[in-house]
């Protein structure tokens, strides 16, 4: 806490200007009026205050707005935002996307801090859903943002917002998240033609069910191995050798290199060795001829 002292003669600030960088902390406390600071917050960013000086300015704003800052002040916080705690931010009501952008810009190039996470949470909750413009903004600043949300939070993403998602935004998503996102993507891209549709849906396919993979295999999509390896194991297992061959097209020969990894390993174990041999890749581990194939999923359900 800065001690209350009288402002020296001639030092009372009439505007927020560069002269304040030469004020000691106690002089800022004594000579800068909080209401003046609030109305001229947009000037603060261009003035090279030290972090100690910014602490004093924050303290003045806290005293003026004990219930939380108004958006007119929040929008112009700039580097002062780095001084805010999650507790401070929880008092805010941020509704403007411009305000959100301005504050994310301050944190640009850094990991998502607890302050930023709280800000985003407040903003999204205030909007009620993760609309396209918000998602666009958030993924531009934090490509991994989408994958940091729980499946429950992702359920509030409208299909129209999926257009803002880039492949790299899904890099760290787990299958549970893709399970939620895939149906939304399918809905969002449903009016596109075959090849265009596949380009858009490809990065969401980790959430696709078997029947959709079967349908894709009929469309000459030539799925690459990287995408295939991210498919749900339970969705891949029922696919026939012929369907996988059609799905992968020329990339089918990549199966050999992945035969020890899931889902390829598990899929091989479910195929007749005769059928695997038709691929001519030397894949081993299929069901020998004359063996009876039991549907393991039925077995598991009964046990």
């Amino acid at each position: 806490e800065v001690e209350k002292t009288a402002c020296p003669s001639g030092k009372k600030a009439r505007e927020i200007d560069e002269s304040l960088i030469f004020y000691k902390k106690w002089e800022l406390e004594a000579c800068v009026d909080a209401a003046l600071l609030a109305t001229q917050m947009d000037r603060v960013n261009a003035i090279p205050f030290t972090y100690e000086q910014l602490d004093v300015l924050k303290h003045k704003l806290d005293e003026l707005y004990p219930q939380g800052y108004p958006e007119s002040v929040i929008q112009h916080l700039g580097y002062l935002f780095l001084k805010m705690s999650p507790e401070d931010i929880r008092k805010w009501n941020v509704t403007s996307l411009e305000t959100l952008k301005a504050l994310l810009e301050v944190n640009k190039g850094h990991e998502m801090s607890p302050q930023v996470a709280t800000l985003i949470d407040r903003f999204v909750k205030g909007r009620g859903q993760l609309d396209k413009d918000t998602l666009d903004t958030l993924t531009a600043f934090y490509p991994g943002y989408l994958c940091s949300l729980s499946p429950e939070e992702l359920s509030s993403v409208p299909p129209s917002s999926i257009w803002a998602v880039r492949p790299q935004d899904l890099d760290t998503c787990d299958p549970r998240q893709l399970d939620v996102l895939y149906p939304k993507a399918r809905l969002a891209f449903q009016n596109m033609n075959g090849s265009e549709y596949f380009v858009k849906i490809q990065s969401f396919l980790g959430g696709a069910p078997t029947e959709d993979l079967k349908a894709l295999s009929q469309q000459n999509v030539s799925m690459d191995l990287a995408t295939f390896m991210k498919l749900r194991t339970d969705a891949v297992l029922p696919l026939t050798v012929a369907e996988v061959q059609k799905l992968l097209g020329p990339h089918v020969e990549g199966l050999k290199a992945e035969e020890r990894h899931r889902p390829v390993r598990d899929w091989i174990l479910r195929q007749r060795q005769d059928d695997l041999d038709t691929l001519g890749l030397g894949l081993q581990g299929g069901i020998p001829n004359g063996y009876l194939v039991l549907d393991l999923s039925v077995q598991e359900a009964l046990s």
Partner: antibody
């Protein structure tokens, strides 16, 4: 429109002093920070010091401490830079610039130090 | 004394993008967001192109952008044009000395 107009070129003898002026127009003068920056021929920019006119007290780069004096006259909106004990390596173009971000610059004043 | 480190020269063809780096310390570039970039054509005064790391003054083309990571700031010029050929200086406000520090300057050559 903000303008910073500097005084004309000077030729000085080693050991003497030079005083360069910078007149500001088109904006408030008193509360801005005015810097002086020099650039020797073919060299980079070098900050010398600066002043906030309404306070009158200047701050200087350590290299020039004791040899440079920066002042300002609020009534004429003019900043001054005086460099003493001149030597040949002080031959340079001297610029004044407004604000810590240096958003406006004067046209420059060439000071030549030669015997 | 040159406090910030810049490459002496960079070059690019018209239409290309180039990036100029500026490395300082945690007490100038790294610790604060008060980095500026200046363009200087031969025989002319420097011109402010970027301030506060990434803000553009009005009248400066949006082909110029600034960013910062750790103790290194960067100026990126996209869609290079012949008139971009100039010297570029980074500058930062150093709180320790309450003054400005500059990089040594980078000569940008636009090829062709």
């Amino acid at each position: 429109q903000v303008q910073l107009v500097q005084s004309g070129a000077e030729v000085k003898k080693p050991g003497s002093s030079v005083k360069v002026s910078c007149k500001a127009s088109g904006g408030t003068f008193s509360s801005y920070y005015f810097s002086w920056v020099r650039q020797a021929p073919g060299q980079g920019l070098e900050w010398m010091g600066g002043i906030i006119p309404k306070f009158g007290s200047a701050n200087y780069a350590q290299k020039f401490q004791g040899r440079v004096t920066i002042t300002a006259d609020e009534s004429t909106s003019t900043a001054y830079m005086e460099l003493s004990s001149l030597r040949s390596e002080d031959t340079a173009v001297y610029y004044c610039a407004r604000r810590t971000s240096m958003d406006y610059w004067g046209q420059g004043t060439l000071v030549t130090v030669s015997s | 004394d040159i406090a910030l480190t810049q490459p002496a020269s960079v070059s690019g063809s018209p239409g290309q993008s180039i990036t100029i780096s500026c490395t300082g310390t945690s007490s100038d570039v790294g610790g604060y967001n008060y980095v500026s970039w200046y363009q200087q054509h031969p025989g002319k005064a420097p011109k402010l192109m970027i301030y506060s790391v990434s803000k553009r003054p009005s009248g400066v083309s949006n082909r110029f952008s600034g960013s910062k990571s750790g103790n290194t700031a960067s100026l990126t010029i996209s869609g290079l044009q012949a008139e971009d050929e100039a010297d570029y200086y980074c500058g930062a406000w150093a709180h320790m000395s309450l003054g400005k520090v500059f990089g040594g300057g980078t000569k940008l050559t636009v090829l062709g």
